[in-house]
């Protein structure tokens, strides 16, 4: 599909990302496909990631992601998480798309991916408080490592948005 056609299709619902950074993918003979992420987003595997520098509540962070046709980060693999960690600042905490709306420790990902306790990356002492119903990625100095921490959803934090790559 030509980018001009894509633009045409998108203008009806407003083009959010006016500049894309694309990589050519190897396709069958006489077909060229481009795999793109919006400018200033990070690319990894089949997704694009935006790391905010502004702080907001969990709900507002999710809304900000939605405005960019994305959602708060859903962590599916260790490799994906390690990639994200490499791009974060150790002194900040970042909301991800995991929350416990009822405070019953029934964790839910924003995209409905099933929560799997055996594939979690909680810091050793976490989650620490059922009144803390949203999850951030943060860096702990002892032991030195990134991990998950439950926090108050209203407390402003930075965030990570995720969207699937755009294919042209």
């Amino acid at each position: 599909q030509k980018y001009s056609q894509l633009l045409e299709k998108k203008t009806t619902k407003e083009l959010v990302h006016t500049t894309l950074e694309c990589v050519k993918k190897n396709m069958p003979v006489e077909e060229t496909a481009w795999s793109c992420c919006p400018k200033n987003w990070k690319s990894f595997s089949s997704n694009c990631y935006f790391i905010s520098t502004e702080s907001a509540s969990w709900q507002d962070s999710e809304k900000d992601c939605a405005r960019m046709e994305a959602h708060l980060l859903v962590i599916n693999t260790q490799e994906e998480q390690d990639f994200i960690f490499q791009n974060l600042q150790e002194e900040s905490a970042y909301f991800v798309g995991l929350s416990d709306p009822e405070g019953q420790r029934h964790w839910q990902w924003v995209d409905q991916t099933p929560y799997n306790e055996s594939s979690t990356f909680w810091h050793p002492r976490e989650p620490s408080d059922p009144n803390e119903r949203c999850v951030v990625l943060n860096f702990r100095k002892s032991p030195k490592r990134w991990g998950w921490n439950d926090v108050n959803c209203l407390g402003p934090q930075r965030s990570v948005c995720e969207m699937m790559k755009i294919h042209l």
Epitope: G103, Q104, R105, E117, W122, P124, R125, P127, S128, D129, P130, K141, S142
Partner: antibody, heavy 117, light 107 residues
Framework: QVQLQQSGTELMKPGASVKISCKAT????????IEWVKQRPGHGLEWIGE????????NDNEKFKGKATITADTSSKKAYMQLSSLTSEDSAVYYC??????????WGQGTLVSVSA | ETTVTQSPASLSMAIGEKVTIRCVTS??????VNWYQQKPGEPPKLLIS???TLRAGVPSRFSSSGYGTDFVFTIENMLSEDVADYYC?????????FGGGTKLEIK
């Protein structure tokens, strides 16, 4: 209100095992970490380990690895600690406590375990 | 493991005096220190939780301060009912570790 009721005194022989319990009431058992703490006269307080009942996740003090096993049953709202291969060094009062944030906010009354031949 | 050194081990104070107990940790634990009071035959009672936060229902004569590795617990005007053992607990790192305790008596 939050209450932790522990099982009664245990008089044990060296080499035996004992399983003590901690029954939680007044809150959602599965959502808070339960701690186990040992107290011997002249030895102060020692943290043994903790469990988050809803997930079964545990954190253990290396010092008690092989000695203490912590489990929980959400249906009965009970946490358990089994102590194996008992010696006189294991004679102590054992407390369970519920964590809130990073504080041991609510405590059981304690279970005395006495080991002697 | 974070070791916690609590001092003094025992303290004899007159009613109305100011009591100060100190805990020093071997690693930086921000302000994740708790302070407990224990009377004979009873479990420890949480007085002050992490962040130097006085627990609900605890008299305001109890307070604490400190950050990093150095922490101080204070009783502003000692009463006879304050006679007890006092412990600090560092909850910043696993394994959690307690100070050795301070036995507070009346002079």
């Amino acid at each position: 209100q939050v209450q932790l009721q522990q099982s009664g005194t245990e008089l044990m022989k060296p080499g035996a095992s004992v399983k003590i319990s901690c029954k939680a009431t007044g809150y959602t058992f599965s959502t808070y970490w339960i701690e186990w703490v040992k107290q011997r006269p002249g030895h102060g307080l020692e943290w043994i380990g903790e469990i988050l009942p809803g997930s079964g996740r545990t954190n253990d003090n290396e010092k008690f690895k092989g000695k203490a096993t912590i489990t929980a049953d959400t249906s009965s709202k009970k946490a358990y600690m089994q102590l194996s291969s008992l010696t006189s060094e294991d004679s102590a009062v054992y407390y369970c406590a519920r964590r809130g944030g990073y504080s041991f906010a609510f405590w059981g009354q304690g279970t005395l375990v006495s080991v002697s031949a | 493991e974070t070791t916690v050194t609590q001092s003094p081990a025992s303290l004899s104070m007159a009613i109305g005096e100011k009591v100060t107990i100190r805990c020093v940790t071997s690693t930086d634990i921000d302000d994740d220190v708790n302070w407990y009071q224990q009377k004979p035959g009873e479990p420890p009672k949480l007085l002050i939780s992490e962040g130097n936060t006085l627990r609900a229902g605890v008299p305001s004569r109890f307070s604490s301060s400190g950050y990093g590795t150095d922490f101080v617990f204070t009783i502003e005007n000692m009463l006879s009912e304050d006679v007890a053992d006092y412990y600090c607990l560092q909850s910043g790192n696993l394994p959690y570790t307690f100070g050795g305790g301070t036995k507070l008596e009346i002079k």
